[in-house]
């Protein structure tokens, strides 16, 4: 940590005679520089030079050959490396007065006559006298304004908006400044910053637009940081809105975006008069071309129960916005002819949700359904098969006699989705068939009995059982069952001998 530089003469302030010369020496442990009242253009009679000495310190001398009123002001010696744009200069100061009977006030630039006040804050009207002994008064349209005066700074106080004049008398001669205009600006102790991006997803060739708005603050410096900044790709714009309240709208426009323009877009607002900072950021992505992604929330084979209400939801990510349509068996779904509806809702900027709704599922609703999403750059689809599940039911149960051989076949036709399984049961004691315990399942490996199953179509099945010889009356039961239910029917098989007796009778 370096100790502050030192100045010779070792005084806070010094009065220098008009047209005389003066010099100020600065000593430091590192390289030092001077800051002085005049601008570079005005300082032709100010000479700065480095001086060698054997103390081991760095010495820089400021010399004025002919002092004038304009040389009145603060001279600061500072270490080169400590100067930053944001901070007030840290160093050693001396204030020089150069009294001039013809110049009561230190000459100022035109911008110094505009005094910006933040709301009800205090401000300085910078009329500085060349002579510390000169009495000064401040006036506005209503007369003398009471305010504290410091010849190094000017009048300090809380001023209302309008023009102010400083007045001084030097050796009986009256001097007046031109009017200082006090202008009030809105400035809050906190920065209210909002970032707004209508879109965060773009494709090559489009124009990126991002805005940052600062509310109730007119004393703001706003900087943009974004991927194309080094190439100077962005166009910035500021618009001040006064109604319904003060708002500064900063717009960054990046035309002809490329993938390289993807990244973080940041605006950093800093209040020009206070160390108040606020930052906002948005991530922008630029795609080479448009895209579509389909993400179903169900599988490629789906089942629905008869009369059930079911929704099939598909998530879609797409840019530019997609057109979404549904097909059934490759034909456009005509909603008004069925109890099927579809809808699309936008969930986020590039996220959509499409729903296919079955109101009361019917057998004919089974089929292949396809969602198609398309925009000018891409087409994507997803197809799934839907099966309407129907409880099994027996359509027909009949027997078929094989003439004199005494063999008989029983056919059981059943339908349902999924395809029903068919089981056979027999009851040999016809008198006890009302009792469930009298029924036994017909096993496949029983001799003289053959069972077989044939699918007729996707939802109909036929089961057959063939008895090589029926010697006494038995009951046969066909049991058709699937996931949704079971149904059974029974049939009496009479032995051929008994049948012929019955025929004779």
């Amino acid at each position: 940590q370096l100790s502050l530089p030192s100045i010779l003469p070792n005084e806070n302030e010094k009065v220098v005679q008009l047209n005389s010369s003066f010099s100020l020496r600065c000593f430091g442990e590192s390289e030092v520089s001077w800051q002085y009242p005049m601008s570079e253009e005005e300082s032709s009679d100010v000479e700065i030079r480095n001086e060698e000495n054997n103390s081991g310190l760095f010495v820089t001398v400021l010399e004025v050959s002919s002092a004038s009123a304009a040389h009145t002001g603060l001279y600061t010696c500072y270490y080169n490396h400590t100067q930053t744009e944001e901070n007030e200069l840290e160093g050693r100061h001396i204030y020089i007065y150069v009294p001039d009977p013809d110049v009561a006030f230190v000459p100022l630039g035109m911008t110094d006559y505009l005094v910006i006040v933040e709301d009800d804050d205090s401000a300085i009207i910078p009329c500085r006298t060349t002579d510390p002994e000169t009495p000064v008064t401040l006036h506005n349209s209503e007369g003398v304004v009471p305010a504290s005066y410091d010849s190094r700074q000017g009048f300090n106080g809380t001023f209302t908006v309008g023009p102010y004049i400083c007045e001084a008398t030097v050796k009986g001669k009256k001097f007046q400044t031109i009017p200082f205009n006090v202008y009030a600006l809105k400035a809050t102790s906190e920065l209210d910053l909002e970032m707004e991006a209508l879109k965060t997803v773009y494709k090559s060739g489009e124009t990126i637009v991002v805005t940052c708005a600062v509310f109730n603050n007119e004393v703001v410096d706003l900087q943009w940081t974004y991927p194309g900044e080094v190439k100077g790709k962005g166009i910035t714009m500021l618009e001040e809105i006064k109604v319904p309240s003060i708002k500064l709208v900063y717009t960054l426009t990046v035309p002809e975006a490329t993938v390289k323009d993807s990244g973080d877009y940041e605006c950093a607002a800093r209040q020009a008069t206070r160390e108040v900072k606020e930052m906002k950021k948005v991530t922008i992505s630029v795609h080479e071309k448009g895209f579509i992604e389909i993400k179903p929330t169900f599988s490629q084979l789906e089942a629905v129960n008869l009369h059930e209400v079911k929704h099939f939801v598909v998530e879609v990510r797409a840019y530019p916005p997609p057109r979404i349509s549904w097909l059934k068996n490759n034909l456009t779904l005509i909603e008004n002819l069925t109890e099927i509806t579809t809808d699309v809702e936008k969930i986020q900027e590039i996220r959509y949700r499409s729903k296919l709704k079955l109101i009361r599922a019917k057998e004919e609703d089974s089929g292949h359904y396809t969602i198609v999403a398309q925009n000018e750059d891409a087409v994507k689809s997803y197809t799934f098969e839907l099966l309407t599940q129907v409880p099994s039911s027996i359509l027909d149960l009949v027997d078929d006699h094989h003439g004199s051989t005494g063999g008989q076949t029983v056919r059981c036709t059943a339908e349902g989705t999924p395809l029903p399984d068919i089981e056979w049961m027999i009851c040999k004691d016809i008198k006890k068939c009302n009792n469930e315990t009298s029924w036994t399942i017909l096993a496949n490996n029983v001799s003289n009995i053959i069972t077989e199953i044939h699918s007729r179509d996707r939802s109909t099945v036929e089961g057959r059982v063939t008895f090589a010889k029926v010697e006494e009356t038995i009951a046969v039961r066909c049991l058709a069952k699937n996931l949704l239910g079971a149904e059974n029917r029974e049939l009496k098989l009479v032995a051929p001998t008994l049948r012929s007796e019955l025929t004779v009778a």
Partner: antibody, heavy 124, light 107 residues
Framework: EVQLVESGGGLVQPGGSLRLSCAAS????????MSWVRQAPGKGLEWVAN????????YYVDSVKGRFTISRDNAKNSLYLQMNSLRAEDTAVYYC?????FGSGSYYIPFDYWGQGTLVTVSS | DIQMTQSPSSLSASVGDRVTITCRAS??????LAWFQQKPGKAPKSLIY???SLQSGVPSTFSGSGSGTHFTLTISSLQPEDFASYFC?????????FGGGTKVEIK
């Protein structure tokens, strides 16, 4: 559907007071600036007052400053205008109106929706 | 305060006519100007904001133009429902001020 319904108008003597209300529905009331605008019989429109979303900022036309107070209750979706020290020249139909937004929300649309108005008559 | 001067104060026109109404501001208001339509006994209705942006739901026969101090509202083809009074309004600075109005009547 955006709806603004004013109430509270009526006949009042000079120097008297009146409180107008505006019930808002069909939009997020707390997200919008609101205004009162008046129209004297057979005359043009005159803006009266503005209030920010949270009520923290209020602006008035000079002729009503110190006499009228605009306020709002976001929980009740209601806008109010308290009118004191009423004068004959305050006789008018008073409308409540909303400020819309466009673009990315940075820009305002003045009075994009209006109520049907309520008549205030100041007369002795 | 900014004065808004509308002209003409009234005009007569027929259905199908092209009608232009002018509004002048006493000082520059950039494009912070709105136009409203009002029918007798009814509340005003927003037509145009930001000098030239059409409010949603307003027919495209209405258009606005201008910037600074001089603005116009144009009805390209007057319809029976367009017979009404029209007001301009500045919202550049407080107090917000309206023009005196233009009454469009049937010829």
């Amino acid at each position: 559907e955006v709806q603004l319904v004013e109430s509270g108008g009526g006949l009042v003597q000079p120097g008297g007071s009146l409180r107008l209300s505006c019930a808002a529905s069909g939009f997020t009331f707390s997200s919008y600036w609101m205004s009162w605008v008046r129209q004297a019989p057979g005359k043009g429109l005159e803006w009266v007052a503005n209030i920010k979303q949270d009520g923290s900022e209020k602006y008035y036309v000079d002729s009503v400053k110190g006499r009228f107070t605009i306020s709002r209750d976001n929980a009740k979706n209601s806008l109010y205008l308290q009118m004191n020290s009423l004068r004959a020249e305050d006789t008018a139909v008073y409308y409540c109106a909303r400020w819309g937004v466009f673009g990315s929300g940075s820009y305002y649309i003045p009075f994009d929706y209006w109520g049907q108005g309520t008549l205030v008559t100041v007369s002795s | 305060d900014i004065q808004m001067t509308q002209s003409p104060s009234s005009l007569s026109a027929s259905v199908g006519d092209r009608v232009t109404i002018t509004c002048r501001a006493s000082q520059g208001i950039r494009n912070y100007l709105a136009w409203f339509q009002q029918k007798p006994g009814k509340a005003p209705k927003s037509l145009i904001y930001a000098a030239s942006s059409l409010q949603s739901g307003v027919p495209s026969t209405f258009s606005g133009s201008g910037s600074g101090t001089h603005f116009t509202l144009t009805i390209s083809s007057l319809q029976p429902e367009d017979f009404a009074s029209y007001f301009c309004q500045q919202y550049e600075i407080y107090p917000l001020t309206f023009g005196g109005g233009t009454k469009v009547e049937i010829k």
